[in-house]
Each structure stands twice: as structure tokens, then as C-alpha cells.
């Protein structure tokens, strides 16, 4: 899980070692600060939870691909 | 493609212990989140617990909490399930069941093992 | 957890009649932000997993006859069969894959009149 230790900035210390299913995934958010120790991708599932992953992951950058696309289109 | 393949069918006594196997090939059990589902003679479908990435951990359906480990070596790719102090009513059909990246449900079962339990 | 409810429990329908099978959520399985239905029915014969014939509640699986249609959304559901053949007999399924546990309908049995 993200921990946000000095808020407002929210750092990963692990990642999860599964991959989602890209349909259970609603959002993402990079984490690029220096003040924490990695680069990661907070996914926000449908239900709410967020989860911590790896950005060199092929399917971390495949999920936020599909997200990326589904954002573009509008629904009808 | 993923491919589940079941360990065969197993008599047991009341009170005895199952293990079931559910070997993985076409991807690795990392990649996969494991889930188990029992049928009963004519009885329909029960979720008894899988995986769930999104809380990274192992969570049972709470009518088998105390009886049931679901465990997985990465090494051969191979989940197992046991229930232990089995009682006649589980005699069932037992299946390994797991979803594609792609998907959410369940698109790739195992064959089904059947557990007897009879004295 | 999420209980799922089918009705019938069972349906007897001539060959080339239409069955129509319900199947009725406690809570919404809907996921406003992409207006998808975290819904899946499956089709089970005796000794044989269950078989995915629609998912997100109206999308048919590939290879699915198109005698096959689901429709509903929310917390209600219902699966067509439009013209009924020997073949479709076995055991229906709904599952909601919406939040854990999945939980599945009891199952209604389809047979021939």
C-alpha cells in the first residue's frame, strides 16, 4: 500500500508482485518525487484500493496504456 | 494460453485431510491469481477462496476459514488446495479456476477433481 | 458480500423456444466510470468446468452462438436463450466478479419439454 509519511507526498516501499487484471484497475498516479526512495504507479482499483506498482513492469505500462485510452474516449 | 491441469480423484475418511494440485503451464502462477471453487452433488457452484492481488493475500470464503490453506510453489507453478477434518458433505467436485490479464472473471478452470469422503 | 439470486431454479422449454433465465444482485455490480457490469454467465454439463458465454453482462464469449444474449444492468440480469436446442441443455451460472468474494447465482437447470 502507498504510505504518505510527509503529506502531501505519497511514497511505494514495495510493489505488488501480481499483476491486476486491467479491468479491475479505474486510475493511476506516478510517483516521481525525490523524496522518495522509487519511482511508482499508485493504481486506484474500482473498488477503491490503491496499489502500489512497479513502472518497469510490462503490465503496469500495458494498464496505464488501457487506462490512458479509456480516459480519451468519450462515453456514449 | 493457460492451461490448468488437476491432481486425480481422491477417497478420503471423515476427519482425514485432501490436498488438491492445480499445475499451471502457458504462463507462470506469479502472473495468475488462483482461485478455488467446489460443486456439490447437484448442488451449484461455491467460491471457497482465492488470491486477491489487490489486498495481496490469500482470502476464504468465510464457511471454509478454519478448515481450508491455500498454498502455491512458484518453483513448479503449482497452487494447492487442503481441507482438513473433512465431513461426508465434502464429497465434491474441486476446481482451480483463474482469469487472463485481459479479463476479470473466471476464463480458464481446471478439469475438476472429485473429493469422496465416506467411511 | 454480494448475493446473487437466480430464478427459476429450473426451466423446462420446448427445442426452439426461447428460455429466459434471471438472475438478480443485492448490490449494484456496476462500475459507473466505465458503465461496465461486472457480470459473467456461465453453462455447465454434467462433468465439465463451467464454460463463459457472456461477460459484462451482455458481451458474448467468442464462439458463443448468438442464440445467446445477455442483457440488464445494475442489479438486475437476465440471459436469452432465443431458440432453445438440444445442445444448450445443463446447469446456467451468474457470478459477479465486481468486489471479492465473487459470488455465484445458485444455478438454474435448463431442460427439454
Known amino acids: 500500500q502507498p504510505d504518505a509519511i510527509n503529506a502531501p507526498v505519497t511514497c511505494c516501499y514495495n510493489f505488488t508482485n501480481r499483476k491486476i487484471s486491467v479491468q479491475r484497475l479505474a486510475s493511476y498516479r506516478r510517483i516521481t518525487s525525490s523524496k522518495c526512495p522509487k519511482e511508482a504507479v499508485i493504481f486506484k482499483t474500482i473498488v477503491a484500493k490503491e496499489i502500489c506498482a512497479d513502472p518497469k513492469q510490462k503490465w503496469v505500462q500495458d494498464s496505464m496504456d488501457h487506462l490512458d485510452k479509456q480516459t480519451q474516449t468519450p462515453k456514449t | 494460453q493457460v492451461q490448468l491441469v488437476q491432481s486425480g480423484a481422491e477417497v478420503k475418511k471423515p476427519g482425514a485431510s485432501v490436498k488438491v494440485s492445480c499445475k499451471v503451464s502457458?504462463?507462470?502462477?506469479?502472473?495468475?491469481?488462483m482461485h478455488w471453487v467446489r460443486q456439490t452433488p447437484g448442488k451449484g457452484l461455491e467460491w471457497m477462496g482465492g488470491?486477491?492481488?489487490?489486498?495481496?493475500?490469500?482470502i476464504y470464503a468465510q464457511k471454509f476459514q478454519d478448515r481450508v490453506t491455500m498454498t502455491e510453489d512458484t518453483s513448479t507453478d503449482t497452487a494447492y488446495m487442503e481441507l482438513s477434518s473433512l465431513r461426508s458433505e465434502d464429497t465434491a467436485v474441486y476446481y482451480c479456476?483463474?482469469?487472463?490479464?485481459?479479463?476479470?472473471?473466471?476464463?480458464?478452470w481446471g478439469q475438476g477433481t472429485l473429493v469422496t469422503v465416506s467411511s | 458480500d454480494i448475493v446473487m439470486t437466480q430464478s427459476p431454479d429450473s426451466l423446462a422449454v420446448s427445442l426452439g423456444e426461447r428460455a429466459t433465465i434471471n438472475c438478480k444482485s443485492s448490490?449494484?455490480?456496476?462500475?459507473?466510470?466505465?458503465?461496465?457490469?461486472?457480470l459473467v454467465w456461465y453453462q455447465q454439463k454434467p462433468g465439465q468446468p463451467p464454460k463463459t458465454l457472456i461477460y459484462?453482462?451482455?458481451t458474448r464469449e467468442s464462439g458463443v452462438p448468438d442464440r445467446f444474449s445477455g442483457s440488464g444492468s445494475g442489479t438486475d440480469f437476465t440471459l436469452t436463450i432465443s431458440s432453445l436446442q438440444a445442445e444448450d441443455v445443463g446447469v446456467y451460472y451468474c457470478?459477479?466478479?465486481?468486489?471479492?468474494?465473487?459470488?455465484f447465482g445458485q444455478g438454474t437447470k435448463v431442460e427439454i419439454k
Open positions: 479456476a483463474t482469469n487472463d490479464f485481459w479479463t476479470g472473471y473466471y476464463d480458464y
Open positions: 502457458g504462463y507462470t502462477l506469479t502472473e495468475l491469481s
Open positions: 488470491f486477491d492481488p489487490e489486498d495481496g493475500e490469500t
Open positions: 448490490q449494484s455490480v456496476l462500475y459507473s466510470s466505465n458503465n461496465k457490469n461486472y
Open positions: 459484462w453482462a451482455s
Open positions: 457470478q459477479q466478479y465486481y468486489t471479492s468474494p465473487w459470488t
